[in-house]
């Protein structure tokens, strides 16, 4: 999640440091994630927490006993797209139903909020220059948000804003391979607010994922799963109302 990069690096080789759809104003670059005491505790929601972290309750998002990855995913084929009209993301010039899903539901069904947890299929895997955009609103008194870029049972990139971890707000990123969470990377810059709308953009780069929130760069996460084409699903979960999830190439 190191942030040692320049605008030139942001889209190396593209000749365009500010590609369409990616934030032009990068905001204050957050400090590198660093080690953070206790950061070695594996995992964002492997169903358990460090001792004392969540006294008397399961950690947010533990989903005890849940079958599969994202119980309650919407019925197959139901993929309403991003809102239309002013303020819809991404900006004009990109596909109107960016990424995957038409602006109305399938076969003329009206678009509406997406059911969370939600799976966004990525049929061709991920590839450099793919921009994934997620729009929603954080619920009041939220505990957590999670994005999981999945490769089968593995989680290639877990992006997990936690609103109250030991009375702190922190973003935890990690990878799960063969059911084992790796080394956490933590970010103390926290751009989410309970009850407020958000836009998360994830730009896939050859060596890392780049994340921006509300048009300001937030963090980078180096690829630990190298076969990007195997990352073929994005799971979205947590305490949010989800408006749209889509992707485009930039």
């Amino acid at each position: 999640m190191a942030d040692n990069f320049s605008l030139h690096d942001a889209l190396s080789g593209s000749g365009n440091p500010n590609p369409q759809g990616w934030p032009g104003a990068w905001g204050n670059q957050p400090a590198g994630a660093g080690g953070y005491p206790g950061a070695s505790y594996p995992g964002a929601y492997p169903g358990q927490a460090p001792p004392g972290a969540y006294p008397g309750q399961a950690p947010p998002g533990a989903y005890p006993g849940a079958p599969g990855a994202y119980p309650g995913a919407p019925a197959p084929g139901v993929y309403p797209g991003p809102p239309s009209g002013p303020g819809a993301y991404p900006s004009s010039g990109q596909p109107s139903a960016t990424g995957a899903y038409p602006a109305t539901g399938p076969y003329g069904a009206p678009a509406g909020p997406l059911i969370v947890p939600y799976n966004l299929p990525l049929p061709g895997g991920v590839v450099p220059r793919m921009l994934i955009t997620i729009l929603g609103t954080v619920k009041p008194n939220a505990n957590r948000i999670a994005l999981d870029f999945q490769r089968g049972n593995d989680v290639a990139f877990h992006f997990n804003p936690r609103f109250n971890e030991n009375n702190r707000r922190v973003i935890v990123c990690n990878t799960k391979l063969d059911n084992n969470w790796g080394r956490e990377e933590r970010q103390s810059v926290f751009p989410f607010e309970s009850g407020k709308p958000f836009k998360i953009q994830v730009l896939v780069e050859p060596d890392h994922f780049k994340v921006a929130v509300n048009d300001a760069h937030l963090l980078q996460y180096n690829h630990r799963v190298k076969k990007l084409n195997e990352i073929s699903k994005l799971g979205i979960s947590g305490d949010i109302d989800l408006t749209s999830a889509s992707y485009t190439m930039i």
Partner: antibody, heavy 115, light 107 residues
Framework: QVQLQQPGAELVGPGSSVKLSCKAS????????IHWVKQRPLQGLEWIGN????????HYNQKFKDKATLTVDKSSSTAYMQLSSLTSEDSAVYYC????????WGQGTTLTVSS | DIVMTQSHKFMSTSVGDRVSITCKAS??????VAWYQQKPGQSPKLLIY???TRHTGVPDRFTGSGSGTDYTLTISSVQAEDLALYYC?????????FGAGTKLELK
């Protein structure tokens, strides 16, 4: 090397059901979606649906949602497609293929529905 | 559903010719397009994905290009073994959809 093995042919009667198989080898089965594609003689390719072997999440072409049921058996790295209420319109070659762009295909099963 | 239109059902060519097969999507598919070659009695074979990425082992006379709604498969110098059916496909969203195919034949 990556292989998707399908039986060569199935002959069934109208109104019956059939379960076609696709056995994967040479890669981690749960890391790639399996897709099923229909091809009628002298006609094009038609996507039926796909399944994620890791958690059995499925997506169907609306046209086939009452016709096809996709399942997997992770222990044998095999994907299945059951076709029900068969008619002559279901006579076709059925391919399984890997991923969203199909880098590997099975050889196809020729299904004949005939009395 | 996204409709993929291959306007030419047949294209006549000679060995050594340069030929371009086109495909038009009914909406922007953001370069999520693949091309396949199919010969009689065989499964389709992947040539190109993400519009321009050549699959492993595909000869470099095959190139893919395009963006938005318009995509092209070009064979720079047609060989006898290239005479086949060619399909485009969008892998942008489900339902995944194919073009009707273009048959490349000898003049």
């Amino acid at each position: 090397q990556v292989q998707l093995q399908q039986p060569g042919a199935e002959l069934v009667g109208p109104g019956s059901s059939v379960k076609l198989s696709c056995k994967a080898s040479g890669y981690t089965f749960t890391n790639y979606w399996i897709h099923w594609v229909k091809q009628r003689p002298l006609q094009g390719l038609e996507w039926i649906g796909n399944i994620d072997p890791s958690d059995s999440e499925t997506h169907y072409n609306q046209k086939f949602k009452d016709k096809a049921t996709l399942t997997v058996d992770k222990s044998s790295s095999t994907a299945y497609m059951q076709l029900s209420s068969l008619t002559s319109e279901d006579s076709a070659v059925y391919y399984c293929a890997r991923h969203g762009y199909y880098d590997y295909w099975g050889q196809g099963t020729t299904l004949t529905v005939s009395s | 559903d996204i409709v993929m239109t291959q306007s030419h059902k047949f294209m006549s060519t000679s060995v050594g010719d340069r030929v371009s097969i086109t495909c038009k999507a009914s909406q922007d598919v953001s370069t999520a397009v693949a091309w396949y070659q199919q010969k009689p009695g065989q499964s389709p074979k992947l040539l190109i994905y993400w519009a321009s990425t050549r699959h492993t082992g595909v000869p470099d006379r095959f190139t893919g290009s395009g963006s938005g709604t318009d995509y092209t498969l070009t064979i720079s110098s047609v060989q006898a073994e290239d005479l086949a059916l060619y399909y485009c496909q969008q892998h942008y969203t489900t339902p995944l959809t194919f073009g009707a195919g273009t048959k490349l034949e000898l003049k």
